[in-house]
Interface confidence: low
């Protein structure tokens, strides 16, 4: 198919373009070029007849066109108006027509752009700046660069007017940068000179240095003031409100106590019209003052608050020292000293951090100590404890319960019986109790400062008859030779005797058995499998006696070294090999076999029918107890003799 290719497609003004013909048919009569998308005689550029090899200009011929024998058309010194479509009309020898259309676009060579601005000296946080890339050029793309980087993404940056205008809203000092614009079209690209944005800002709040505010008599006072500002700020100093001088630095030699007071630095920006001031209070001491401790938190809460203790006053070139409980500071990750040692921070205070704390200022002759400071750490209440610990009482006695919970400030206590409030006291006294006084006794401790409350509940049973006791254990499945077990006879009762039996017998004498807690607790140290017995506890008083149900101790043990049976190690060929492995263990172990190191099966019995000498070798039984985490094994050598030879008999016997 006949096609036209424009080389190049995008043409710069003044350059040339070649309309290159592809698939031109053979045996032509001639061809003609037209401006536009169709054959229009009024817009013919040039015609060419093969036979005469002559070109004839048409109405649209400009004198800049050259036609080639291959039908391609060269247009030189391109102008803007040349943009558009071009149609080739081919007449073949058989007078059949064929047409093809091509096109190109003409773009101007771009001039070097420049940037215009609507505000040469914008004020920070107040003004907007609009940069416009000049000149406005048709079919041009506009790009912007900030410090030779493409535009950052920012809600304060907005492109408009076909990207020709870059607006910076609410300019900041950070917008002070080099801005360039670039114009591009398909045939050229030009970049402007850079424009530096000069943002007026400040002054910020001035800073006075050095920071120390305490001086000794006779020293020189040299204060410097600085405030970020564009243009640079103008500075003024005031002492106790009275103007001193318009300089950035204030110098007073050989100061005295009379130089104490408020020192104000004022920074002024003449372009923004803004003023900012900073005041520092200077104290001049006639001699080193006695230090004192200030705290940022007089009532810190335990495990919540940090406390910063600061040694006052701040004095230049001074060494600060600290003591806690009349000792130098202990090493602790919760104790932190500031760089100048003036501030001691206690992170996450505890009730043990009360102190006392002292700080000291070291001078040439001695160390001046502050008065001690005690921290009032608020804590608790902890879980209250109810005493005595008895839960069983006989009718007719007096019930006297006392409640205590560690707390600062001291806890306020309330007693509830079966959920009903009784009284707001630390002690609860009920005389001449009866069975009706049985119930749930709750002590509630409340810390009014922290707002925290904690409760403890105790079951009180009033009965002439002792209840049937029960045994609690701290370890239901102890491991042999490793664990200890403590049995406790419940409940705890007043004026009660506790007794123990093992397998129906009184306790044997053994260094591994220990009674404690008024015989209420029986401890077995380093339990063995022989301790797996029935344990019973009993309680008795002058009125009644009772025994618990037995508790059988389940001791985990083993596996012991396994035994392989039968013990035979020599077999005749053709016999059946039936080996059984057994190991004492609780719970029962898992068994596995290996022959000559090769795993076989996970069974207790290994059976091989009609063995041959090939079955000679080492037979290992492995046992494993998952509960104790222990393993064991045994190895047995098996020899298989060929039929007819009796192992162990000498020849000719």
């Amino acid at each position: 198919k006949l096609t036209i290719e424009s080389t190049p497609f995008n043409v710069a003004e003044g350059k040339e373009v070649l309309l290159l013909v592809h698939n031109l048919p053979q045996h032509l009569f001639g061809y003609s070029w037209y401006k536009g998308e169709r054959v229009d005689g009024n817009r013919q550029i040039i015609g060419y007849v093969i036979g005469t090899q002559q070109a004839t200009p048409g109405p649209a011929y400009s004198g800049r066109e050259i036609i080639y024998p291959n039908a391609s058309l060269l247009i030189q010194n391109i102008i803007q108006n040349d943009t558009g479509f071009y149609t080739l009309h081919v007449i073949k020898s058989d007078l059949v027509n064929e047409e093809a259309t091509g096109q190109f676009r003409v773009y101007p060579e771009l001039p070097k752009p420049s940037i215009s601005s609507n505000n040469s000296k914008p004020v920070e946080d107040k003004d907007a700046v609009a940069f416009t890339c000049e000149p406005e050029t048709q079919d041009a793309t506009y790009l912007w660069w900030v410090n030779n980087q493409s535009l950052p993404v920012s809600p304060r940056l907005q492109l408009s007017n076909g990207n020709r205008t870059l607006t910076l809203f609410n300019v900041t000092r950070n917008d002070t940068a080099s801005y360039k614009c670039e114009t591009q079209n398909p045939v050229s690209a030009r970049r402007s000179d850079s424009v530096i944005l000069n943002v007026l800002y400040g002054p910020d709040a001035p800073t006075i240095s050095p920071l120390n505010t305490s001086y000794r008599s006779g020293e020189n006072l040299n204060l410097s003031c600085h405030a970020a500002s564009n243009p640079p700020a103008q500075y003024s100093w005031f002492v106790n409100g009275t103007f001193q001088q318009s300089t950035q630095e204030l110098f007073i030699p050989n100061i005295t106590v009379n130089n104490s007071g408020s020192y104000t630095c004022q920074a002024h920006n003449s372009d923004t019209g803004l003023n900012r001031t900073t005041v520092t209070t200077i104290t001049v001491y006639a001699e080193p003052p006695k230090p004192f401790i200030t705290s940022n938190n007089s009532n810190p809460v335990e495990d919540e608050d940090a406390v910063a203790l600061t040694c006052e006053p701040e004095i230049q070139n001074t060494t600060y020292l600290w003591w806690v409980n009349n000792q130098s500071l202990p090493v602790s990750p919760r104790l932190q000293l500031s760089n100048d040692n003036r501030t001691l921070t206690l992170l996450s205070v505890t009730r043990n951090d009360v102190g006392p704390y002292e700080c000291g200022i070291q001078n040439e002759l001695s160390v001046d100590h502050s008065d001690p400071v005690i921290l009032n750490v608020l804590y608790g209440p902890d879980d209250p404890t109810i005493s005595p610990s008895y839960t069983y009482y006989r009718p007719g006695v007096n019930l006297s319960l006392s409640c205590h919970a560690a707390s600062n400030p001291p806890a306020q206590y309330s007693w509830l019986i079966d959920g009903n409030i009784q009284q707001h006291t630390q002690e609860l006294f009920i005389s001449n109790i009866t069975e009706k006084n049985s119930g749930l006794y709750t002590c509630q401790a409340n810390n009014s400062a922290s707002g925290h409350s904690r409760t403890t509940v105790k079951t009180i049973t009033v009965s002439a008859e002792l209840p049937k006791p029960s045994i609690s254990s701290n370890n239901s499945k102890p491991v042999e030779d490793k664990d200890a077990v403590a049995f406790t006879c419940e409940p705890e009762a007043q004026n009660t005797t506790y007794l123990w039996w093992v397998n129906g017998q009184s306790l044997p004498v053994s260094p591994r058995l220990q009674l404690s807690n008024g015989n209420r607790t029986l401890t077995l140290f380093n339990v063995t499998r022989n301790d797996a017995r029935a344990y019973v506890c009993g309680i008795q008083n002058s009125v009644s006696a009772n025994r618990s149900d037995p508790v059988t101790l389940d001791v985990l043990y083993g596996p012991d070294t396994p035994i392989i049976s039968p013990p035979d190690s020599s077999y005749l060929s053709g016999a059946n090999l039936n080996l059984s492995c057994h190991s004492a263990s609780n719970p029962s172990p898992q068994y596995s076999w290996r022959i000559n190191g090769i795993p076989q099966q996970h069974t207790q019995v290994l059976f091989i029918a009609k063995i041959t000498p090939n079955n000679n070798g080492t037979y290992a039984c492995f046992v494993s107890n998952l509960a104790t985490g222990r393993n064991n094994s045994i190895v047995k050598s098996i020899t298989v003799s060929a039929s007819g030879t009796s192992p162990g008999l000498s020849a000719g016997a």
Partner: nanobody, 116 residues
């Protein structure tokens, strides 16, 4: 005009990687820069990464450190290497010139789906 054909999308698990390609007919850097965009369902198209003809790159904060844009001028091809993908990266991804002049000529895009 610049013709753009994106490819390389697909379904990937969170934490996985994909590499997108964009074949351009005509000069890849016709206006001196190219970019990748994405559009999630019900959301506006957003700029993900851009590269200039000089090779300098810019990234949106939400992909910084995970995505890398590159170009092969000889092949007129733009790439986007996407690592440590997240479910919120699910979108249709397009390449184009970064500025509005090129936005009349969108390609068909390539779908990226990140499952959790």
């Amino acid at each position: 005009q610049l013709q753009l054909v994106e490819s390389g999308g697909g379904l990937v698990q969170a934490g996985g990687s994909l590499r997108l390609s964009c074949a351009a007919s005509g000069s890849l850097f016709r206006i001196n820069a190219m970019a990748w965009f994405r559009q999630a369902p019900g959301k506006q198209r957003e700029l993900v990464a851009a590269i200039t003809s000089a090779g300098s790159t810019n990234y949106a904060d939400f992909v910084k450190g995970r995505f890398t844009i590159s170009a092969d001028n000889a092949k007129n091809t733009l790439y986007l290497q996407m690592n440590s993908l997240k479910p919120e990266d699910t979108a249709v991804y397009y390449c184009n010139t970064p500025w509005p002049v090129g936005r009349d000529y969108w390609g068909q895009g390539t779908q990226v789906t990140v499952s959790s």
